[in-house]
């Protein structure tokens, strides 16, 4: 399928022209420009960068570029009253204090406004007490502590290692366990790859490096004070007591040097098994409290951060479509960073910048896309996806009627091993076809396609000869578009070898050491992986905006629906007696999936055969494809999570980063054996099966012949 059929273009203006215009050297230059000073959300520096990007996008040739501002709740440390944690002796004297700031990297000693490590939205407080080590603070870790080890976290300060799950879930779990404070730390087992030096000599985390991050449990709400609606000039704001998702106990992050000082004194229970041991030179005792000689010592937190309503700025650029200007393909990524943002987000923002430049170059030569392309530089992603969510809330009516697709563009790299793609099943074939046309940047795959190197290095667990494509979870700006609005979404980046590198994310994530030099020296000196990611993201946008028939294959949804139905059924079948007792049947769901499969197959046949020269029929078929994702939206949302409305996918209730399939049923079944009222619990399972079956059937019917 060619993409050069859009109006007013010469044959040279096709996908190849767009891709050929993308240059690694430009991405490198843009990354350098975006990373010389911090661009924390809500600061003057980030406002200035917004205006710079607005100006440059205009120069590149976009039709319009506007700033969209909102006044949202952000969180900052107190500049004169720093946050830290102490070990105190029986007299209350501080005998050890954790760091007040990270040791600055070489060349950045004199940079001002480096925000010290903090957990954004932590309440103020100075709790003191005994420590309990809770491993990763996952749901299963607290089950192990409370149910198996009979350790009570109530009134304790818990210390948890970063990794495996979103930090906000850790804090929520700690709160539910009754903890009065949370210390988060980066263990070398998760953030120090063997055989690699720490920064500035390599890409590993030094002992003084600390991961910043928000600890909200927003569940898609956006600004905590204006859930569901934009935080505009006339917004009604909730009181702080009614704000969505704020933690109720003080939280603070530390590095592994400081963690060693706390953990080396731990007494109490030994770790339950080896999975609770990290790589520090400590016993990983669970506690509570310190061992014999140190048993009178306590841990004290000193947290003085403040929550403040602050103005943020999105940059929204428009390249008007020539044929279907009322159909929007969106490419968006955030601009705000915790410090320099060498990887997160500026490796993504630099790629977006080059994609805009390439599209602009084509436009200046007389080309236009078939559909409108919107480009977004989001603000305050690090504070809870606030910029993207507020903009989507403000424009929800337009988006739900006109939104074709959203492609996310945060960090372009989290490693340099192979491609990683998470997307709606509708985009599987698009991604496969595109990557077959792109050259692999990988060593040993010269002259081979990206598809080939990706499939070799990251094979699909289900289909031989195909690459792994993962479910969308959350923790990034696609959330509101996909989970709330039901707009087909996807993301792509270069990643590490998950088999050999078992650390979580990349070691320097959200630390002061995430610099331009980190990328240029250690990850991608030639910027060839950045260029490949630009080709993938840009190529997807090009096809989505320019192909006559939308490049969505509804049959791929049918395949995964069957897989997800099988999976949730097998989970339920772990309780055969209860299923029999409460007459739990999945027949309706399997029937709906079967119907969806048959209808999707027939739709695909019609898609091959219809008269593409008939604009009405073309538009009709494209609308059925566009609105298929929308059909999976339940207007009532998931239980207790009204802004997660997608019935097939939602962020896991136990890890915001991970996607869960049939989340309503999954959550109803989770830990069901511990529910006090089994009849009520299994009743909810049945209700969720009903909702899922209805939704799949209803979605199938949107693909039926219209009359």
């Amino acid at each position: 399928k060619s993409s050069n059929e859009a109006t007013n273009i010469t044959p040279k203006h096709n996908m190849k022209a767009f891709l050929d215009e993308l240059k690694a050297e430009n991405i490198k230059k843009f990354l350098y420009n975006f990373t010389q000073i911090p661009h924390l959300a809500g600061t003057e520096q980030n406002f200035q960068l917004a205006k710079q990007i607005q100006s440059q996008w205009k120069e590149f040739g976009l039709d319009s570029v506007e700033l969209a501002h909102y006044d949202v709740l952000l969180s900052y440390p107190n500049k004169t009253h720093p946050n830290y944690i102490s070990i105190i002796n029986e007299d209350g004297n501080e005998i050890f204090n954790t760091s007040l700031f990270e040791p600055p990297p070489p060349g950045y000693e004199n940079v001002s406004d480096i925000v010290p490590p903090f957990s954004a939205f932590s309440p103020q407080g100075m709790p003191e007490g005994d420590l309990v080590y809770v491993n990763y603070a996952r749901t299963e870790d607290f089950f192990k502590l409370e149910r198996d080890m009979k350790i009570n976290c109530s009134g304790k300060i818990v210390i948890a290692r970063y990794g495996k799950v979103f930090r906000g879930n850790k804090v929520k779990n700690a709160q539910l366990a009754g903890a009065k404070g949370v210390i988060l730390y980066s263990d070398p087992a998760d953030y120090f790859a063997p055989g690699v030096k720490s920064y500035p000599d390599g890409w590993n985390l030094p002992g003084g490096g600390v991961q910043r991050g928000n600890i909200l449990n927003l569940n898609g709400a956006g600004d905590p004070l204006t859930p569901g609606y934009p935080a505009n000039e006339y917004a009604y704001r909730r009181g702080i007591a009614e704000a969505v998702g704020l933690p109720s106990i003080p939280v603070h992050p530390i590095g592994y040097y400081d963690a060693q000082k706390l953990l080396e004194k731990m007494g109490g229970s030994a770790p339950p098994d080896s999975s609770w041991r990290g790589s520090l030179k400590v016993p990983y005792n669970v506690g509570p409290g310190f061992t014999g000689n140190f048993s009178t010592q306590k841990v004290k937190m000193h947290i003085h951060s403040t929550n403040e309503v602050t103005r943020i700025y999105n940059v929204i650029g428009t390249l008007r479509g020539a044929v279907e200007p009322d159909r929007y393909v969106i490419l968006g990524g955030h601009r705000d960073s915790w410090v320099f943002g060498g990887i997160d987000p500026q490796s993504g923002a630099a790629v977006v910048h080059e994609i805009v430049r390439s599209f602009g170059t084509l436009k200046k030569e007389g080309w236009r896309p078939r559909r409108t392309i919107l480009f977004a530089s989001w603000d305050a992603e690090e504070f809870g996806l606030l910029g993207s969510t507020e903009w989507a809330e403000e424009n929800s009516r337009l988006l739900q009627e006109r939104g074709v697709a959203y492609i996310n563009a945060d960090s372009s790299i989290e490693g340099n091993y192979t491609l990683r793609v998470d997307c709606t099943p509708l985009m599987y074939s698009l991604v496969h076809n595109l990557t077959k046309e792109l050259k692999s940047p990988d060593e040993g795959f010269e002259g081979k396609s990206l598809y080939e190197s990706w499939t070799k290095k990251s094979p699909s667990p289900e289909f031989s000869g195909m690459p792994r494509i993962s479910k969308l979870g959350s923790g990034n700006d696609f959330e509101v578009f996909f989970q709330r609005l039901g707009i087909a979404s996807g993301r792509a980046r270069y990643t590490k070898n998950w088999e050999t590198n078992k650390f979580s994310g990349y070691p320097l994530y959200h630390s002061v050491y995430e610099t331009y030099e980190l990328v240029e020296k250690f990850y991608d000196p030639m910027f060839k992986y950045h260029l490949t990611v630009a080709q993938v993201r840009g190529g997807m946008v090009f096809e989505l905006a320019n192909s006559i028939v939308l490049p969505f294959d509804c049959r791929d949804y049918a395949v995964v629906l069957r897989k997800y139905a099988d999976k949730i059924y097998s989970i339920s079948m772990k309780h055969p007696q209860e299923m029999k007792t409460y007459s739990v049947s999945f027949d309706s769901l399997f029937s709906a999936v079967k119907n969806f499969t048959e209808i999707a197959s027939k739709f695909s046949e019609r898609l091959q055969d219809f008269d593409k020269s008939n604009p009405i029929v073309l538009r009709m078929m494209n609308d059925q494809l566009m609105f298929l994702e929308r059909a999976f939206i339940d207007p009532l949302g998931l239980p207790d999570r009204p802004f997660y409305r997608h019935v097939i996918y939602a962020p896991s209730s136990h890890n915001k980063y991970a996607g869960e399939s049939f989340p309503g049923i999954y959550d109803a079944l989770f830990d069901i054996e511990s529910k006090v009222d089994p009849s009520k619990a299994w009743g909810e399972v049945k209700r969720q099966i009903y909702v899922a079956a209805f939704t799949v059937q209803a979605a199938a019917e949107t693909l039926s012949e219209v009359a």
């Epitope: 760091s99 007040l100 040791p103 070489p106 000693e109 003084g208 040097y257 080396e264 140190f294």
Partner: antibody
Framework: QVQLVESGGGVVQPGRSLRLSCAAS????????MNWVRQAPGKGLEWVAI????????YYADSVKGRFTISRDISKNTLYLQMNSLRAEDTAVYYC?????????????WGQGTTVTVSS | SYELMQPPSVSVSPGQTARITCSGD??????AYWYQQKPGQAPVLVIY???ERPSGIPVRFSGSSSGTTVTLTITGVQAEDEADYYC??????????FGTGTKVTVLG
């Protein structure tokens, strides 16, 4: 290049005070913990004091606690050791040594030392 | 106060292996560091974090740790390795301590 240069040593009477300085150059002073280590004539190394890069912690050997004070001036890239109530047993070569802040890289750069003699 | 014990001296022929031990109760929870000091000179770091070698230090120097003992091994000793060697570690109160020191003599 990376360099530490101590100064301020000399001969002093017991009970008197002395201030040692250590001028740092060629590296990011604000990223390094700084130590004082001494060596009495013909004896082994004795750690004296440490100040963390962010000044969050200062620790002293029991033998000098209450008498010596470690400090630093980031603007001058200089480390200090204020030594009060000096004793004969404080006679030693005093070295300053850096270690990367909150890390496990050890004291990787040392000065050449300055000699303190406490004698009546 | 906390002590790190080393043998006062070790003698070794050129090309042979020298092993210097350092014992202390806190070593299972604390990293050890090794320094070489030649007469009239400042100490030089030769091993950090129990077993890591700084750049510029010959590969014949290695470190290991087991329980309350750490060991510095010099494989294929050379004449220029004759020096005093000190281990160093920390205790749980945040203070540092040096070992008693070991004089390595290269025979012949």
């Amino acid at each position: 290049q990376v360099q530490l240069v101590e100064s301020g040593g000399g001969v002093v009477q017991p009970g008197r005070s002395l201030r040692l300085s250590c001028a740092a150059s060629g590296f990011t002073f604000s990223s390094y913990n700084m130590n004082w280590v001494r060596q009495a004539p013909g004896k082994g190394l004795e750690w004296v004091a440490i100040i963390y890069y962010d000044e969050s912690n200062k620790y002293y050997a029991d033998s000098v606690k209450g008498r010596f004070t470690i400090s630093r001036d980031i603007s001058k890239n200089t480390l200090y050791l204020q030594m009060n109530s000096l004793r004969a047993e404080d006679t030693a070569v005093y070295y300053c040594a850096r270690e990367r802040g909150r890390d496990y890289y050890g004291m990787d750069v040392w000065g050449q030392g300055t000699t303190v003699t406490v004698s009546s | 106060s906390y002590e790190l014990m080393q043998p006062p001296s070790v003698s070794v022929s050129p090309g042979q292996t020298a092993r210097i031990t350092c014992s202390g109760d806190a070593l299972p929870k604390q990293y050890a560091y090794w320094y070489q000091q030649k007469p009239g000179q400042a100490p030089v770091l030769v091993i950090y974090k129990d077993s890591e070698r700084p750049s510029g230090i010959p590969v014949r120097f290695s470190g290991s740790s087991s329980g309350t003992t750490v060991t510095l091994t010099i494989t294929g000793v050379q004449a220029e390795d004759e020096a005093d060697y000190y281990c160093q570690s920390a205790d749980s109160s945040g203070t540092y301590v040096f070992g008693t020191g070991t004089k390595v003599t290269v025979l012949g």
